[in-house]
Every structure is written in structure tokens, then in C-alpha cells.
Interface confidence: medium
Amino acid sequence: ELCDDDPPEIPHATFKAMAYKEGTMLNCECKRGFRRIKSGSLYMLCTGNSSHSSWDNQCQCTSSATRNTTKQVTPQPEEQKERKTTEMQSPMQPVDQASLPGHCREPPPWENEATERIYHFVVGQMVYYQCVQGYRALHRGPAESVCKMTHGKTRWTQPQLICTGEMETSQFPGEEKPQASPEGRPESETSCLVTTTDFQIQTEMAATMETSIFTTEYQ
């Protein structure tokens, strides 16, 4: 079952699949000035059996100048269910998915291929996100998205990634800040120190946010 939509767009982030589930299709796109050979495949398909998966078909591009051809019009995103990914090396690889049964590795490049690969993902596909250079994540979290089938419809889960910080202001581009989980279940008890009538709970197991006020004469 193909996923209906693209993986979510995260500002200043790119995504990449570590491996591709069987059934995934990759469009045979050629760079400007080149086109698919007349008898060439429209797409590559990840297929396989229980022990081995591989890409069927091969993409081949030839120079458009060799013959007078009509320019192929690429459908707009709403007309064509596109799956886009860039060549991103992700540091977050909990599992080498390429070694998993039923998955294909990233297909090798072909001569004169387009700069951007367009994938058609299937249900169960997982993609990983990371911030582009010059941006960093607000905190660590599962920065992946999975295509799931719910009530007969496909949807991508939302990756927990927000990229922030411009290159000139980011001291350590791409650095992620560690995110600790609260110890136990926090209770949202707070107190305002201006009025001391509020009951306060202060325990190691509680996450509290206390607000107070300090005034100084303006000079």
C-alpha cells in the first residue's frame, strides 16, 4: 500500500530513509538536458523474497540533444504523489535498516540522474530527520516519521524535531541539546511568591514552576 502523502516538512530539516521497504518505487528522473531512454523504465522497484531484497529495473538517461523530443512536463505536487528525499547522512540510526529483511539499500546513482530523487513510499516506511547545517535541534527526541495505516487511510507520524538558530548565531552548528526526562510523574503545583497563601508541593518527584517578582528602582 503506497503512502498517500509526503513525509512531513520540518523547517530547516531534511529527511532520509536508511533503507526502503519492498514495494517502494523510485522515479527514473534525469537531470536537465537529459531524458529517459525510450525503452527505459519509469521507475525502480524494491522487490525481494524472505532472504534478499533488491531494486528491479534500471534507470537510464540519454542526452536530449540526440533527437528532437517533446519536453516531459512534470506534474505539480498535488497532481503527482511525490516522495522526496535528499542525500543526507543521518547520525541517528538505531538499526541498520538495510540489513533488515524486506528492505532495499539506497540505490546506486545512475549516469545523469536528477539532483533530487522522488520516492513513492509504502506503509511501514520510516524516514529520519536532521537539521540542515547551521541549525540545531531544540532537544533530542525521536526524529523520525513512519507511514501508518489508520482507518483505511495512510498518514505519517510527526517527527519530534524543531530546528532553530541561524548559522551566524549558532556557535555549534548542528549541535543538539540533550533532553532529560522528568524523574517520575511531575505534578503541576506552583506558587507565586508575591502572595504566600498558595499551598506548595516541593518533592523530588514534582516538576514545579514557581514565579516570583523582584522590583528595582529604574536609574
Epitope: 512531513p8 530547516h12 531544540l138 532537544h139 524543531i162 540533550p178 532529560a180 518527584m205 514545579t208
Partner: antibody
Framework: GESLKISCKGS????????IGWVRQMPGKGLEWMGL????????RYSPSFQGQVTISADKSISTAYLQWSSLKASDTAMYYC???????????WGQGTLVTVSS | SVLTQPPSVSVSPGQTASITCSGH??????AYWYQQKPGQSPVLVIN???RRPSGIPERFSGSNSGSTATLTISGTQAMDEADYYC?????????FGGGTKLTVL
């Protein structure tokens, strides 16, 4: 014209490793985002509307974040909340708020 | 980025209340919902689409489709009367909806 510094103390979790945000709510109005700070290294991000109007700071040694004005105006009268940016980027725990009233 | 909510929604006790929040590409972003009762701090009721924090009743649910996020309260109770705010992120900036006052008739 007076200066003012309000504080927000967190406890019961690793204060240094969660962002703290500040939110303004003027009387009878909605929530307005002011900015946030990462106490671990004092990395600070301001909403464009509040850039230059307030200063956000933190002292991780005492698990406290601050919101400061150098010169208050009557239009600064509002309730100010601090909130923790929790797992999944929700504002999961909020302070009770500090009511700031500026009058001449 | 602007999030648009209806200023008010009315519902009878026991009925289902739906509060919408619309904004550009909201369906591709995080969507959160907060409840604020008079004189109290906001409380997170829906985290990331449809996840309810501990302690939030099951009658609160969320959905996110296209450019609209929806908070649904089934079997609305009088105690649910409050202001509700949607929220998302735009880069490192939090964006709130204008708020919806839920009245339980």
C-alpha cells in the same frame, strides 16, 4: 519607567536541560509568546514582537529563569507565565503566573 | 504564521464540542491544545495530535488534517467550560491561536 525582574523557579526535574518559555496574557486577552531560554547554556530566542523590549535570562545553579524590563510602560500590565518546553515540545508545566500592574 | 480559532463555541451538557484551529500547513506541524479556566494557568490537554497527557479525561481528543487541527470534547461537562488555545511552532517561535471560549449551556 521602573525596572522589573520576575523569576520562575523549576524543581523536581533537570532544569538545565529543558527550555523555559515566557508567555504574556493581557487582561481579557489571549496568550502571547515572548521567548524562550535554554538554561544549560543561556541560549535565548525572542519573539519578534518582544525583541528588545524584555530580557530573558536564567541561573541554572538555582534553577531559575528570569524576565526583565528596564523601563516599564502601562501597556506592560499583564499576567506573565513561565512554562517548561517538555518532551515533544509541548508547554507541559506552567507557573502560576505573576501579575504585573504598571500604573502612574 | 497565524492560527485562527472561532471566538466562541456553545454546547449542551453531554453533547460533543468541536473547536477548530486553522493555519498554513498546520497538518504537517505539531498541534497542541491548552485549557485555561478563569484565574488559572493554562493546562496542556492535547499533545502532538491526539496524545492526552496523564490526568486528562478520555473525553478530550484531537485530530489534525490538512490545515486544520480540531479539539473534540465528547460528553461535555460543565467543568469543561473554559478558554481553549491551540498552539504550534514556527521555527523556534511558539504561535498561539486567539483562543475559543467554550460555553456549556
Amino acid at each position: 519607567g521602573e525596572s522589573l525582574k520576575i523569576s520562575c523557579k523549576g524543581s523536581g526535574y533537570s532544569f538545565s536541560t529543558y527550555w523555559i518559555g515566557w508567555v504574556r496574557q493581557m487582561p481579557g486577552k489571549g496568550l502571547e509568546w515572548m521567548g524562550l531560554i535554554y538554561p544549560g547554556d543561556s541560549d535565548t530566542r525572542y519573539s519578534p514582537s518582544f525583541q528588545g523590549q524584555v530580557t530573558i535570562s536564567a541561573d541554572k545553579s538555582i534553577s531559575t529563569a528570569y524576565l526583565q524590563w528596564s523601563s516599564l510602560k502601562a501597556s506592560d500590565t499583564a499576567m506573565y507565565y513561565c512554562a517548561r518546553v517538555g518532551d515533544g515540545y509541548s508547554l507541559d508545566y506552567w507557573g502560576q503566573g505573576t501579575l504585573v500592574t504598571v500604573s502612574s | 504564521s497565524v492560527l485562527t480559532q472561532p471566538p466562541s463555541v456553545s454546547v449542551s451538557p453531554g453533547q460533543t464540542a468541536s473547536i477548530t484551529c486553522s493555519g498554513h500547513k498546520l497538518g504537517e506541524r505539531f498541534a497542541y491544545w491548552y485549557q485555561q479556566k478563569p484565574g488559572q494557568s493554562p493546562v496542556l490537554v492535547i499533545n502532538q495530535y491526539i496524545r492526552r497527557p496523564s490526568g486528562i479525561p478520555e473525553r478530550f481528543s484531537g485530530s489534525n488534517s490538512g490545515s486544520t487541527a480540531t479539539l473534540t470534547i465528547s460528553g461535555t461537562q460543565a467543568m469543561d467550560e473554559a478558554d481553549y488555545y491551540c498552539q504550534t511552532w514556527d521555527g523556534s517561535i511558539v504561535v498561539f491561536g486567539g483562543g475559543t471560549k467554550l460555553t456549556v449551556l
